[in-house]
Amino acid sequence: VPDKTVRWCAVSEHEATKCQSFRDHMKSVIPSDGPSVACVKKASYLDCIRAIAANEADAVTLDAGLVYDAYLAPNNLKPVVAEFYGSKEDPQTFYYAVAVVKKDSGFQMNQLRGKKSCHTGLGRSAGWNIPIGLLYCDLPEPRKPLEKAVANFFSGSCAPCADGTDFPQLCQLCPGCGCSTLNQYFGYSGAFKCLKDGAGDVAFVKHSTIFENLANKADRDQYELLCLDNTRKPVDEYKDCHLAQVPSHTVVARSMGGKEDLIWELLNQAQEHFGKDKSKEFQLFSSPHGKDLLFKDSAHGFLKVPPRMDAKMYLGYEYVTAIRNLREGTCPEAPTDECKPVKWCALSHHERLKCDEWSVNSVGKIECVSAETTEDCIAKIMNGEADAMSLDGGFVYIAGKCGLVPVLAENYNKSDNCEDTPEAGYFAIAVVKKSASDLTWDNLKGKKSCHTAVGRTAGWNIPMGLLYNKINHCRFDEFFSEGCAPGSKKDSSLCKLCMGSGLNLCEPNNKEGYYGYTGAFRCLVEKGDVAFVKHQTVPQNTGGKNPDPWAKNLNEKDYELLCLDGTRKPVEEYANCHLARAPNHAVVTRKDKEACVHKILRQQQHLFGSNVTDCSGNFCLFRSETKDLLFRDDTVCLAKLHDRNTYEKYLGEEYVKAVGNLRKCSTSSLLEACTFRRP
């Protein structure tokens, strides 16, 4: 019988008492085969973290700073359940740390040196740790003691709870630096008042502070937020302009064998029986013998943290950067305006080989990082382990939802002004063998399908989106008799046609021979009835253009396109017979890397782009024997996006809507994780 006990860790007598009450009340409402609570008492949160890591306890609820500690080796804990605040309809699991300024003050985030600062309190998250952590490498050396460095960075501050004797500048704006509400500039409202009164130039608070202190929109409009990219935004655009997004209070567990499903089952049942306004005799979110015992008193309920989400992703790049800077205190030798090498994310060993060659030729400008799937690469870019990669539109959508931005677009047509003219897109098509003359768009049911990969534009999002509109369900593996759609569940019929060996079967990378455009077409040639690819795929792999044994004798005339009106047309008539127009592949990165990725890639394409004529004696960035490694092989240049610099603007309203409709069919664990952080 599996042990269905969750050992909750308590850090005080009062918490232990509440835990025992929790245990007893749960026993009274949950059947004997359901989850139960046991209580483990430790002296501190750090002791609880160690106990969970050592399998002496299973769960504890932590503030963000401690979630970071819990994640660090050797603890390796992960977030499993989040407390939420506000309403069930609009649950808030995060708050945003922001830098508020007066509208007419005219400076940016990178111009804070010499300004006057207002903080909620020394050592507090939004008011100190996050802003000072992010500014850490701009502080004058020596950076220890930290208070001295901060005092020398700003021209004056109010940092309640600081030592006014040792660091008088930190108390210059609020004499005495009182550590309670007796100090008018203490806490969130106090720090905002410090700005409002004109004592300070910037207040470090949380996003709700402005709304709580200024009910009137006209008054709020006198203030702005400083963004990390050195722009400003209105105060209500805090989701796009903040210093960090911080989880409020989170249950953590072991990463391996951590009972996360059991913990969720327990807490979900607990909130049903003892949540807000549920029971008089025991309340989960109430602490008669103290404050915030086990859970925050202000919490309204729990939400399950998506399983794909580790602590780094949950806490977010900015928060992790700030806390790491403060804890480790390491900065680059001398902060320069020069760009660091761009860490390119390569999929599997084939892309890694090409990336390595690029890296050698780039003379220090490009480094390589490997991952097994596109989603793993996106996650690495999010958390700073990698910086950039080029993505199909379907993954540009996921990357965008995860906070990444497009920087340059692949262009596929030769033109005089390639780099300045991003193209409208390419065509997603359905290809069949000419010999299968009875096959049309309307009778694909029961046929064998070949897809570039799940989640990709031409191979999945467009054809499956159109199909979904017809069949109104997501069971595509029942619609086709079998197929190869790399990234599908291994036991799905949509992995049956794939050719990868062993663990590589149906993997969404080049270890699966039927992956990508060329792979999907090969799947059609060898096994399938229909391939969903781009309009250039057939000409690129026929007429001897692909020397691989399977392709070298193929003839374009032996293939036709399926049109949505039920007719068929020759391959060259793609402009009048396609499923939809697809946005070109694009390079994505984090917002903080945008300028450097743009600059370095433009240099790199001038050195190794399509202007290089002899690829046998020179490295060519856009060549890989029809395998589309790192970039599509038909890329002519990487083009500027001009104002299409968000994923929505880049992909266009129509495509975003189409992918949004398919979301109900999505199997993307990363998309689920990212929409948890930003619904």
């Epitope: 090409k354 003379v363 004696g617 890989s624 395998k627």
Partner: nanobody, 117 residues
């Protein structure tokens, strides 16, 4: 198609030196990039050092300052001078010229380097 053969490996004590050679069956003068990789048991193959036709070099962080890559186009040979060897340098070392594409598994026999006291 140029064939590459690695040699020069062996057993060496920590702190010792070895010089690996990779001899090509044809001219390497026009080859854009040549590189040394290594693979330890149970590990992925990793780039150790690379050199371009123009002589620009790149090294893995773990070998910087200890290893030197060079090519002699007249002798159609790629070299890897390995100094201050450490136990963690133990692996099979392979050379490549990337000319057979990134897709086929075209690695040669490699040469075993063992660093042990």
């Amino acid at each position: 198609e140029v064939q590459l053969v690695e040699c020069g490996g062996g057993l060496v004590q920590p702190g010792g030196s070895l010089r690996l050679s990779c001899v090509a069956s044809g001219s390497i003068a026009s080859i854009a990039t040549m590189a040394w990789y290594r693979q330890a048991p149970g590990q992925q193959r990793e780039l150790v050092a690379g050199i371009t036709r123009g002589g620009s070099t790149k090294y893995a962080d773990s070998v910087k300052g200890r290893f030197t890559i060079s090519r002699d186009n007249a002798k159609n040979t790629l070299y890897l001078q390995m100094n201050s060897l450490k136990p963690e340098d133990t692996a099979v070392y392979y050379c490549t010229d990337y000319s057979r594409g990134y897709y086929q598994d075209y690695w040669g026999q490699g040469t075993q380097v063992t660093v042990s006291s």
